[in-house]
């Protein structure tokens, strides 16, 4: 069987696969998922292995009309790096070179400067290039390599393997060599792979459940200790509980030196952040620290200084924390919209079952808004997802110049951030270069503020307006308004009424549903307008909801169904990749960022229409 | 690289008792298993009794009953408690870890104790 980094070269001109008869004749073959032979992969960024043989696919010479043959795999030698051109041309890197099906008389694959149908190759059973099925480097744990990447194929006692392997050992560990000759290096790591006993390279806290790796003998940037303890399906370190840092204080008081965690700055228009996306709720900075020179946007626990953390350039090589099992969060239960009949005084307005309120123009110091709050019958809003923001941003009538009282503070324990109504903290958003918790300044309250709505801390002593939130009152069952403009079951934001499909559906199906009310899958034209649509779907417990945008029509160019320009994008990590596809908003801890998934999945989606009685604004000029 | 220490070797009456010991050291992460094999003169070395990390333990049918085989964890020490023993003459006992390490080999062997029950 294929494993998922296999894949057969396919010509659809000839519909034949290639095939390694031998190192020195690399033909075409009617295509056989079982055949060994035809069995190739990515082993780096630019090398292509026979699984067969365990060697590389490379030319003698860069030039034209050479015949294309097994080497060791060297990953050194320019006469084995490969790259894919545009569609799907497969090239020797650097040159107009193409790997070519041969001729009548040429039964070897060539090495050829026309780039025709008989230079395209596809990954067999799909319409994908060679690169789609890419190379992903594995970084090792413990061993003597510092935690380098497993080199494939690598040799050990004479022998070549291509996967991680026990051999050499009784207990079933695997590992791999992080060079190709393990018999002269002697370079090697323990491979990050589920396998008996692999659980020892973990520490549990029993009281949490939680488990954490010290990875201390590893000197990885922070990028590529992220994604090694991604590939042990962690994360690095947050850390969000103050027991939490104690246990991680006892766990390295041994070491000395720094180790990455998960807090950085990366995000352009945010805040310091979690990279598990855990809430920025508790702080440990060593003194002066964070530092504000510009590219120091990771953080390093530092063992040697009681465990505090430090902010320094991401491409420094340190060790690393990963953490997996049970969040610390507490679990919070956030009701989806629709569950909540909603109904709210006047002048509030209602939200996933609660009411709103800005206080603009009466600037009150924290504690006095939140006297007021309470008298009303609420207190200082808390905000628990990006939904909940969202919806403050676009439907509450906050203001770009806005500076407004939240709840949330480290009054009561200097250095961890609580809500002021006592709910646990889920979710921050912070402001570039906050919490600063500037010490000469005691900065212990908190406002939302710019046009984003994100957070600061803040004197407390300031005189601002404030956000008030309270339990909305169900009063039976709730009224559907008909919004000014919108049919019945349509809600109206700006110009334009949306409605949720409930019919789970393909791309193209919600496409024709959403013409048939002669409506389009929605378009999403800034950020406000995503901020009302996160909010609008976020909360509900569907994955998925299909937006406008594909790249169905241009491979690699994502368009509106309608015509109209891509002006603004919210895109997930990794995302859009290089698989074609359509684009559909996520839900959850990831709520209103952008996935590409396959056009013919089935998921939920949002319809969009002009406002009956609108008056269209100019499109904009270019 | 790892080291192994036996100790505890020597003369035995039939029915008598003797404690082995096996300490490891060195660049050690973790120890898997640990087990003490014998060899008779002439013949195939043998697996006696074998512990994992976990605490998971197995006996030859030969000593089952007789020999336990505890650890100390906090020293990376296994014992050989061996009980009610057999006028067998003169086997070498030797000891084994099973360890993550600075190499890909896990075994790491001792030199072995002698035991010898005299009649």
């Known amino acids: 069987l294929l494993d998922t980094r296999q894949f057969l070269i396919y010509n659809e001109d000839h519909k034949r696969c290639v095939d390694a008869v031998s190192p020195s004749a690399v033909q075409t073959a009617a295509c056989n998922q079982d055949a060994e032979s035809q069995k190739f992969r990515w082993v780096s960024e630019s090398q292509i292995m026979s699984v067969a043989f365990k060697l590389c696919l490379g030319v003698p010479s860069k030039t034209d009309w050479v015949a294309i043959t097994l080497y060791a795999c060297d990953s050194k030698s320019e006469f084995q790096k490969w790259e894919c051109k545009n569609d799907t041309l497969l090239g020797i890197k650097g040159e107009d070179l193409f790997f070519n099906y041969g001729n009548r008389q040429e039964k070897n694959i060539m090495l050829y400067k026309g780039s025709g149908l008989w230079s395209r190759w596809k990954i067999y059973g799909t319409t994908d290039n060679l690169c789609s099925r890419g190379y992903e480097a594995m970084y090792t744990l413990l061993g003597n390599a510092n935690g380098a990447t497993c080199a494939f194929p690598f040799k050990f006692e004479n022998k070549w393997y291509a996967d991680c392997t026990s051999a050499g050992r009784s207990d079933g560990w695997l590992w791999c060599g992080t060079t190709t000759d393990y018999d002269t290096d002697k370079l090697f790591g323990y491979c990050p792979l589920k396998f008996e006993g692999s659980e020892s390279l973990w520490n549990k806290d029993p009281l949490t459940s939680v488990s954490y790796q010290i990875n201390s003998k590893s000197a990885l940037t922070w990028h590529q200790a992220r994604k090694s303890c991604q590939q042990q399906n962690a994360e690095l370190l947050s850390i969000t509980e103050i027991h939490e840092q104690t246990y991680l204080t006892g766990l390295t008081s041994s070491l000395t030196s720094g180790l990455w965690i998960g807090l950085n700055s990366l995000s352009f228009n945010s805040g310091w952040q979690w990279s598990d996306r855990s809430p920025f709720r508790y702080l440990n900075w060593l003194p002066g620290s964070p530092s504000a020179e510009p590219g120091k946007s990771c953080v390093s626990l530092n063992p040697g200084k009681n465990a505090k953390w430090e902010n320094l350039e991401c491409v420094q090589k340190l060790g690393y924390i990963c953490k997996k099992g049970n969040t610390t969060l507490n679990s919070f239960v956030i009701p989806s919209e629709s569950d909540v009949p909603t109904h709210c005084p006047s002048q509030w307005w209602p939200y996933a079952g609660h009411c709103y309120k800005i206080h603009r123009d009466e600037k009150k110091i924290q504690r006095d808004a939140l006297t007021t709050c309470r008298k009303e019958g609420g207190d200082l809003t808390s905000i628990h997802t990006i939904e909940e923001l969202d919806f403050i941003i676009s439907q509450l009538g906050y203001e770009p110049n806005d500076e407004l009282w939240i709840g949330l503070n480290d009054i009561k324990i200097q250095m961890y951030f609580e809500w002021s109504d006592g709910t646990p903290v889920t979710f921050t958003k912070w402001l570039r270069g906050e919490p600063s918790h500037e010490n000469n300044r005691q900065e212990d309250c908190v406002v939302m503020k710019g046009k984003d709505g994100y957070w600061a801390d803040r004197g407390c002593e300031w005189p601002l307006g404030y956000i008030c939130k309270m339990k909305s009152r169900s009063q039976g069952p709730e009224i559907v308004e008909v919004e000014k403009g919108c049919r019945k079951g349509w809600k109206k934001h700006h110009f334009y009424c949306y409605m949720i499909g409930h019919t789970l559906s393909t791309f193209a199906e919600a496409n024709q549903t959403c013409n048939n009310e002669n409506a389009y899958l929605t378009t999403i034209e800034d950020r406000y307008e995503q901020a009302f649509l996160t909010s609008f779907v976020g909360l509900r417990p569907e994955k998925y909801f299909w937006t406008g945008l594909s790249d169905i029509q241009t491979k690699g160019t994502f368009q509106w169904t309608i015509e109209e320009e891509v002006r603004f994008t919210h895109w997930n990590s990794d995302m859009p990749g290089r698989k074609p596809g359509c684009v559909a908003m996520r839900t959850g801890i990831a709520g209103g960022l952008w996935d590409v998934l396959k056009c013919d999945e089935k998921a939920k989606f949002v319809c969009k229409h002009w406002a009956e009685g609108v008056t269209h604004p100019p499109k904009p000029t270019t | 690289d790892v080291q192994l220490v036996e100790s505890g070797g020597g003369l035995v009456q039939p029915g008598g008792s003797l404690r082995l010991s096996c300490a490891a050291s060195g660049s050690i992460f973790t120890i898997n298993a640990m087990g003490w094999y014998r060899q008779a003169p002439g013949k195939q070395r043998e697996e006696v009794a074998a512990?994992?990390?976990?605490?998971?333990?197995n006996y030859a049918d030969s000593v089952k009953g007789r020999f336990t085989i505890p650890r100390d964890n906090a020293r990376n020490t296994v014992y050989l408690q061996m009980n009610s023993l057999n006028p067998e003459g003169a086997d070498v006992y030797s000891c084994k870890a099973v360890v993550v390490t600075t190499t890909p080999y896990s075994d790491s062997w001792g030199q072995g104790p002698l035991v010898t029950v005299y009649s």
């Open positions: 512990i994992t990390s976990g605490g998971r333990t």
